[in-house]
């Protein structure tokens, strides 16, 4: 007998063809011999089956000797053997209906687990293979689990159910809730305004929750809260803010913080957490601030950086358009009795200058 796979909630069309290309009498029955539907001349008749209001046929095809059974809004319990009786013949079709659902919300926090559950008719032994938007394949039986969801797992998951060498495909849209970047570094000269941005990697109709930025200054022995805020329908409102520094926060997404001045005492690392309504767990983004200061005190020209820098970074002092006078993989460099002119302090790595500060040294008379 023919096997047809269907998806829960979908519509299926079971075919039945007579050898005569004309409208003749036919009946569709289930395995209990209960009539589902048939015809009487050109009229569609329905039997007492539980499919009554969901079963139909295509009258336009009867004249061609085709008598399909259409079942709408499929249910797992519709899985059965359906018999088409026409011209003293019986055509049997086995219908197997499957359902695949995410057994939690389809909006999940980065790092959480996704579990997909397969609903299948009794007696079936399907296999399932799912492919994530980034090409990851997972296989299983009745349940499939993916732990530690990543940002790249956002999108349409395509799952193929295989039974009796037939396939049916499901598509499930998953949204991974995360910040666009796990970590970022801002390099600033002393006194410059600092902009911290925390763009989200997803869009939802309504976004409600609360957040906080904790800051660990390089010079401080412990971390402290800098700001707490609420998020209501994508509108940001500050609940509490420290007096030093005087942070300002944007009222709209993306989350945006402004530090009026980069100062050595603020250099360090921050952790912004966002707790979303009806979600367990929090979103995190690390942000780092590196501050540079160039100063001249009497006969000493000094350049210093504060904050979380890689030990590979080079700090240099050079007179404009000349070779570096001093370069060290350290956080402070200096030149004694500097020549007059425009001096540059440079923080650089193998690929670029990350931060630059100019200081004018006046001639000593």
């Amino acid at each position: 007998k023919k096997v047809v796979l269907g998806k829960k909630g979908d519509t299926v069309e079971l075919t039945c063809t007579a050898s005569q290309k004309k409208s003749i009498q036919f009946h569709w029955k289930n395995s209990n011999q209960i009539k589902i539907l048939g015809n009487q001349g050109s009229f569609l008749t329905k039997g007492p089956s539980k499919l009554n209001d969901r079963a139909d046929s295509r009258r336009s095809l009867w004249d061609q000797g085709n008598f399909p059974l259409i079942i709408k809004n499929l249910k797992i319990e519709d899985s059965d053997t359906y018999i088409c009786e026409v011209e003293d013949q019986k055509e049997e079709v086995q219908l197997l209906v499957f359902g695949l659902t995410a057994n939690s919300d389809t909006h999940l926090l980065q790092g959480q687990s996704l579990t997909l559950t397969l609903e299948s008719p009794p007696g079936s032994s399907p296999s399932v293979q799912c492919r994530s938007p980034r090409g990851k394949n997972i296989q299983g039986g009745k349940t499939l689990s993916v732990s530690q969801l990543e940002l790249q797992d956002s999108g349409t998951w395509t799952c193929t159910v295989l039974q009796n060498q037939k396939k049916v495909e499901f598509k499930i849209d998953i949204v991974v809730l995360a910040f666009q970047k796990a970590s970022s570094i801002v390099y600033k000269k002393e006194g410059e305004q600092v902009e911290f941005s925390f763009p989200l990697a997803f869009t939802v109709e309504k976004l409600t929750g609360s957040g906080e930025l904790w800051w660990q200054a390089e010079r401080a022995s412990s971390s402290k809260s800098w700001i707490t805020f609420d998020l209501k329908n994508k509108e940001v409102s500050v609940k509490w803010v420290t007096q030093d520094p005087k942070l300002q926060m944007g009222k709209k997404l993306p989350l945006h913080l402004t530090l009026p001045q980069a100062l050595p005492q603020y250099a360090g690392s921050g952790n912004l957490t966002l707790a979303l309504e009806a979600k367990t767990g929090k979103l995190h983004q690390e942000v780092n601030l590196v501050v540079m200061r160039a100063t001249q005190l009497q006969k000493n020209l000094t350049c210093e950086v504060w904050g979380p820098t890689s030990p590979k970074l080079m700090l240099s002092l050079k007179l404009e358009n000349k070779e570096a006078k001093v370069s060290k993989r350290e956080k402070a460099v200096w030149v004694l009795n500097p020549e007059a002119g425009m001096w540059q302090c440079l923080l650089s790595d193998s690929g670029q200058v990350l931060l630059e500060s100019n200081i004018k040294v006046l001639p000593t008379w």
């Epitope: 570094i185 890689s310 923080l347 790595d349 193998s350 690929g351 670029q352």
Partner: antibody, heavy 122, light 107 residues
């Protein structure tokens, strides 16, 4: 497309010198740090040296310090490795590789050449 | 200089297996660690950078984790093309140093 092609390998006697070249194409060579990495026959990878984007800084593995010199000519999009006082243990395939440096935080060698073979033997 | 100790030095596994390779640094390297794959006669290929960032075009069955001194490369479900030698590289400070490699063979 982005490409690195090494040349200059060959058979050389111990104590002699050899200069390897690495021709870069398909990217702005002067914006990247560049490495030499080597692999002795049947052995693992060994980092040799790095030169910064502007040639201002160079760092070496202890095993080659004082004998090898890394240099670059940004106008010719070419990286060099001058190898002096060669020893049998310098026999290896020499690869050049591009270093990506992002935000002074993320570093990686994303593009590699196919390698050139250096054999030091009497 | 920072020493990198990779283990195991060789590993036999089957297609579909989950495989873990570890790398230990002789001192704290924060998250300055990358993983490279090399096949015989070929140049190394970048898989993971800065501990856990998947390089563009690398299959998501590869993942990296760790921080400080202990790091892990995990292949969630081995594919035939994954049989190769894997190296960790500390790029936290100069001189850079590779681990001695892990040869992944078919069981």
């Amino acid at each position: 497309q982005v490409q690195l092609v090494e040349s200059g390998g060959g058979v050389v006697q111990p104590g002699r010198a050899l200069r390897l070249s690495c021709a870069a194409s398909g990217f702005t060579f002067s914006s990247y740090g560049m490495h030499w990495v080597r692999q002795a026959p049947g052995k693992g990878l060994e980092w040799v040296a790095i030169i910064w984007y502007d040639g201002s800084n160079k760092y070496y593995a202890d095993s080659v310090k004082g004998r090898f010199t890394i240099s670059r000519d940004n106008s010719k999009n070419t990286l060099y490795l001058q190898m002096n006082s060669l020893r049998a243990e310098d026999t290896a395939v020499y690869y050049c590789a591009r270093e990506v440096a992002l935000e002074g935080y993320y570093y990686y060698m994303d593009v590699w050449g196919k390698g050139t073979t250096v054999t030091v033997s009497s | 200089d920072i020493q990198m100790t990779q283990s195991p030095s060789s590993l036999s596994a089957s297609v579909g297996d989950r495989v873990t390779i570890t790398c230990r640094a002789s001192q704290d390297i924060r998250n300055g660690l990358g993983w490279y794959q090399q096949k015989p006669g070929k140049a190394p290929k970048l898989l993971i950078y800065t501990t856990s960032n998947l390089q563009s075009g690398v299959p998501s069955r590869f993942s990296g984790s760790g921080s400080g001194t202990d790091f892990t490369l995990t292949i969630s479900s081995l594919q035939p093309e994954d049989f190769a030698t894997y190296y960790c590289l500390q790029d936290y400070n100069y001189p850079y140093t590779f681990g001695q490699g892990t040869k992944l063979e078919i069981k």
